[in-house]
């Protein structure tokens, strides 16, 4: 935040900061969630051997996790700010049900799983503010989400471990792509 004339509240050597711009706030928030995902992945990898499974084996799943594609306009070639922003918000909204699923999947990192879920809600809010004039954002149906959640929770232990690992890996990749794209906006 700027200093009022005649005020000085900073370290003498430090340049003064402005209030965070919306982009900086979003950037910090994504870093926060990514750090949370790292902590959750660490617990998952310590608990099961999913992290050693080949990408091909893990790809053989019926989870419809959001993923960035060329048409979404988030990559450097064919970058389109509006299309990309819609994709990021829509993708995060779709991830919410999977983050809800993660809530009972951790023991020592329970608080972090909650923090990742909560922070994703905040991130969506920040992004929706940035995308005020975009109306192409579709919210997943609550009933669809509820039945998907029930289905995921009914899986056997091995499949639940795999699902947890896949969600975390996909969410990390989605956020990293989002972070790169948002830095171009």
């Amino acid at each position: 935040a700027p200093v009022l004339p005649g005020e000085d509240s900073k370290d003498v050597a430090a340049p003064h900061s402005q209030p965070l711009t919306s982009s900086e706030r979003i950037d910090k928030h994504i870093r926060y969630i990514l750090d949370g995902i790292s902590a959750l992945r660490k617990e998952t990898c310590n608990r099961s051997n999913m992290c050693e499974s080949s990408k091909e084996a893990l790809a053989e799943n019926n989870l419809n996790l959001p993923k960035m594609a060329e048409k979404d306009g988030c990559f450097q070639s064919g970058f389109n700010e509006d299309t990309c922003l819609v994709k990021i918000i829509t993708g995060l909204l779709e991830f919410e049900v999977y983050l809800e699923y993660l809530q009972n999947r951790f023991e020592s990192s329970e608080e972090q799983a909650r923090a990742v879920q909560m922070s994703t809600k905040v991130l969506i809010q920040f992004l929706q503010k940035k995308a005020k004039n975009l109306d192409a954002i579709t919210t997943p149906e609550p009933t669809t989400n509820a039945s998907l959640l029930t289905k995921l929770q009914a899986q056997n232990q091995w499949l639940q471990d795999m699902t947890t690992h896949l969600i975390l890996r996909s969410f990390k990749e989605f956020l990293q792509s989002s972070l790169r794209a948002l830095r171009q906006m």
Epitope: A1, S9, D35, G36, A39
Partner: antibody
Framework: YPQLVESGGGLVQPGGSLRLSCEAS???????MSWVRQAPGKGLEWVGS????????YYNTKFIDRFTISRDNSKNTLYLQMNSLRAEDTAVYYC?????????WGQGTLVTVSS | AIQMTQSPSSLSASVGDRVTITCQAS??????LAWYQQKPGKAPKLLIY???DRYPEVPSRFSGSGSHEDYTLTISSLQPEDFATYYC?????????FGQGTKLEIK
């Protein structure tokens, strides 16, 4: 476990020093952090903040000569070094994540300055 | 430093009442203002940021409004768990400053 846990509070004599710690979960590694204090029965007062790498620190002018904020990211810990303590520094000290507004807070640690 | 004048300093109300707390800054804030709720012995909890954005999972009965120097927190229908102290905070300028608080008590 809670995401932010302050410690190091206690009874100290006027003129004494104290170092408060705020142990943070790994999520706070890339975040600006602030210290905020609250005297018994009084309102909230911002002490200062620090950027993720610890390069830039911002202080409330009131504390710039006596208080120093630092962090050790390898230990995921934020510190508040308080020197030349006075009776009016008696307060609960909170650490919080700083997005300009504070969206995550520790539970606080009580510092009592008294002879 | 920016002065934040919160009013009233205390307020008695009943469950179901509509309550308004105001915060006046000594300088233009560009909506860079937050509202917090604090219960005895607990840390403050963020309710509203950027003047009127409700933090996720904060009940919809809480709303923020205002511009320039004048801001308002409204609780549309008081619930038993809302009896607490409320603070505004400006983050337009450093040092960040808080209002002196409004203690909301049961009538």
């Amino acid at each position: 476990y809670p995401q932010l846990v302050e410690s190091g509070g206690g009874l100290v004599q006027p003129g004494g020093s104290l170092r408060l710690s705020c142990e943070a979960s790994v999520l706070f590694k890339h975040q600006d952090m602030s210290w905020v204090r609250q005297a018994p029965g009084k309102g909230l007062e911002w002490v200062g903040s620090i950027d993720p790498r610890g390069d830039h620190k911002y202080y409330n002018t009131k504390f710039i000569d006596r208080f120093t904020i630092s962090r050790d990211n390898s230990k995921n810990t934020l510190y508040l070094q308080m020197n030349s303590l006075r009776a009016e520094d008696t307060a609960v000290y909170y650490c919080a994540r700083d997005l300009d507004f504070m969206d995550e807070w520790g539970q606080g640690t009580l510092v009592t300055v008294s002879s | 430093a920016i002065q934040m004048t919160q009013s009233p300093s205390s307020l008695s109300a009943s469950v179901g009442d509509r309550v308004t707390i105001t915060c006046q800054a000594s300088y233009w804030l560009n909506s860079e203002l937050a509202w917090y709720q604090q219960k005895p012995g607990k840390a403050p909890k963020l309710l509203i940021y950027d003047g009127d954005d409700r933090y996720p999972e904060v009940p919809s009965r809480f709303s923020g409004s205002g511009s320039h120097e004048d801001y308002t927190l409204t609780i549309s229908s008081l619930q038993p768990e809302d009896f607490a102290t409320y603070y505004c905070q400006q983050y337009r300028y450093t040092p960040y400053t808080f209002g002196q608080g409004t203690k909301l008590e049961i009538k």
